[in-house]
Interface confidence: low
Amino acid sequence: SQPQAVPPYASENQTCRDQEKEYYEPQHRICCSRCPPGTYVSAKCSRIRDTVCATCAENSYNEHWNYLTICQLCRPCDPVMGLEEIAPCTSKRKTQCRCQPGMFCAAWALECTHCELLSDCPPGTEAELKDEVGKGNNHCVPCKAGHFQNTSSPSARCQPHTRCENQGLVEAAPGTAQSDTTCKNPLEPLPPEMSGTMLM
């Protein structure tokens, strides 16, 4: 079998064997090595010498195999746009950002660029749980049977109705989607004119 060509090597068809780690240099019609993540091209290749790479300086990065002559500047997550940092910038990876709690991504341009406050879910509903936090605005769904939620909130969850019997009490008023069951003490009989009004 033919020995594997090591960069730099001539390429007549303008393609290189390893597209990820090599690139075609048209001036010399050769294939040269790309620089690995975390580095940049400090000296371009020639017919007799392969690419020379150098490590990215502090506060800069290159994420992929590249033939860039500079590293990208690390950028902070912009709190004005509702973003917060979840992982710092390294020489091989840009700063990782996400939407702040209670916000969702409203604008994407390869990554999230702008977050907005989540909409409130009204009483009797809760936000449908999403696979990934911050990916979309709240979709409010009704509380399931036997549950209630009594606030306007972006994050409140429907809670099960209180079972009066579990507390040694009796039901005075049934729960709804927006209110809990009302319980009363069965041991204290009420005067007829107040029947059903003294609630615990």
Partner: nanobody, 112 residues
Framework: EVQLVESGGGLVQPGGSLRLSCKAS????????FGWYRQAPGKQRELVAT???????WYDVSVKGRFIISRDNPENTVYLQMNSLRPEDTAVYYC??????WGQGTLVTVSS
Amino acid sequence: EVQLVESGGGLVQPGGSLRLSCKASGTTFSDRAFGWYRQAPGKQRELVATISTAGLTWYDVSVKGRFIISRDNPENTVYLQMNSLRPEDTAVYYCNTFRGNWGQGTLVTVSS
């Protein structure tokens, strides 16, 4: 296009109070959450307070207990009541809808 107009800024002594207003037009006001931001000279713009559609509020630790954000849906206006003002509160104050809309800002100067 949403239009936001801030007003109420001015010069005030330390310990004094101001009430900022943000009048919105071109939007269904009650469907929007609002925030007040500020930008001091040479510093990054920072979020100070937010109010949700239902009136739930959030405050940055630097203003908690001193500033109060509120909204008047019929008037299409968001307010920022600023009490016990300090020199470090000096900045241009902006209101925002969290959808990229900014007003021109109103300058608050706290100085004796």
